[in-house]
């Protein structure tokens, strides 16, 4: 799976969309999870309604919401009041039994609020040394991760 980058501004809401084949994943609940380390597990953040027929109902876990358009085949995740610590690698998943198929890998980047004059030095931009000039941007907030880019900060 390629990784798609979604950029949001600190303090604002970020909407992440994950398209999928609605027939292939018919009847399956969906989930949003956060990747813990490059090869670590993906920790569930929020999942759609326990009843698949009610997947269109928005479910919240803290500041993260999920809703599924099962006919159109689009899973939407909203990260409200985006914070620097929200930056990182996530996955949209399709659940069947105890298994999860990856629908999309997502890298969330948090940009400093231009109106916020506090020190932005603690904001982390994964792969910030890379040039993104030629990167593809979807809806002005997302792009595909360039080959060779590292989705996690280097560990000491």
């Amino acid at each position: 799976h390629n990784t798609t980058v979604f950029q949001g501004v600190a303090g604002q809401s970020l909407q992440v969309s994950c398209p999928y084949d609605s027939m292939k994943h018919w009847g399956r609940r969906k989930a949003w999870c956060r990747q813990l380390g490059e090869k670590g597990p993906c920790q569930r953040v929020v999942s759609t309604h326990n009843l698949w027929l009610l997947s269109f109902l928005r479910r919240w876990n803290g500041s993260t919401a999920i809703t599924d358009d099962t006919l159109g085949g689009t899973l939407t995740i909203t990260l409200r009041n985006l914070q620097p610590h929200d930056a990182g690698l996530y996955q949209c998943q399709s659940l069947h039994g105890s298994e999860a198929d990856t629908l999309r890998k997502v890298l969330v980047e948090v940009l400093a609020d231009p109106l916020d004059h506090r020190d932005a030095g603690d904001l982390w931009f994964p792969g910030e040394s890379e040039s993104f000039e030629d990167a593809h941007v979807e809806h002005s907030i997302s792009r595909s991760l360039l080959e060779g880019e590292i989705p996690f900060p280097p560990t000491s």
Epitope: M23, G27, W52, G97, S98, E99
Partner: antibody, heavy 123, light 107 residues
Framework: EVQLVQSGAEVKKPGESLKISCKGS????????LAWVRQMPGKGLEWMGI????????RYSPSFQGQVTISADKSISTAYLQWSSLKASDTAMYFC????????????????WGQGTLVTVSS | DIQMTQSPSSVSASVGDRVTITCRAS??????LAWYQQKPGKAPKLLIY???SRQNGVPSRFSGSGSGTDFTLTISSLQPEDFATYFC?????????FGQGTKLEIK
């Protein structure tokens, strides 16, 4: 009416190749996963693998990975199971089965089965 | 892989009897379990899915129960056409695995 019609019985020699088929009708073939299940003589059922004909996404049981190839041709609503080099131990009845996801619990079960293809491998 | 163990491996019963077949999973599988009936020379037929939901057209004398690791299939009043082999199957994870089967014979 949903139907899965499998190709006829085969008698082969060890080392030969073989491709058996399963043709789906009465439903949208590209919209359901389709599995292959082995039943050796007098024995139980073994799940070999599964394919989504819409995009040919395939999963194999570790026991069968590298031993068989599962494929599909959506233009003729047909799935295939093939061997490049048969062994006597491949002698069995092979079933294809449609996998249907039930939204009650978001998992899938085999609701329609083909009649089976008997493969005999003997020198 | 998840191992599925059925008991008994065979059972003799008479028409009208109540029969219970059990299936145990080597690890918890929630309610992701199916029961199939197979007659000699025929393909299996789905009876029960999601541990307790009856497939369309399956007589009400067939019922399933259980969750986690222990499951049962009950036939409340055996009919002549019920003599067959029954398999459980977990739908929790890949690879899907079946029990070894329970042969239901006429006493």
């Amino acid at each position: 009416e949903v139907q899965l019609v499998q190709s006829g019985a085969e008698v082969k020699k060890p080392g030969e190749s073989l491709k058996i088929s399963c043709k789906g009708s009465g439903y949208s073939f590209t919209s359901y996963w389709l599995a292959w299940v082995r039943q050796m003589p007098g024995k139980g059922l073994e799940w070999m693998g599964i394919i989504y004909p819409g995009d040919s996404d395939t999963r194999y049981s570790p026991s069968f990975q590298g031993q068989v190839t599962i494929s599909a041709d959506k233009s003729i609503s047909t799935a295939y199971l093939q061997w490049s080099s048969l062994k006597a131990s491949d002698t069995a009845m092979y079933f294809c089965a449609r996998s249907r996801t039930f939204y009650y619990d978001s998992s899938d079960y085999f609701d329609y089965w083909g009649q089976g293809t008997l493969v005999t491998v003997s020198s | 892989d998840i191992q599925m163990t059925q008991s008994p491996s065979s059972v003799s019963a008479s028409v009208g009897d109540r029969v219970t077949i059990t299936c145990r999973a080597s690890q918890g599988i929630s309610s992701w379990l199916a029961w199939y009936q197979q007659k000699p020379g025929k393909a299996p037929k789905l009876l029960i899915y999601a541990a307790s939901s009856r497939q369309n057209g399956v007589p009400s004398r067939f019922s399933g129960s259980g969750s986690g690791t222990d499951f049962t299939l009950t036939i409340s009043s055996l009919q002549p056409e019920d003599f067959a082999t029954y398999f459980c199957q977990q739908a929790d994870s890949y690879p899907r695995t079946f029990g070894q089967g329970t042969k239901l014979e006429i006493k």
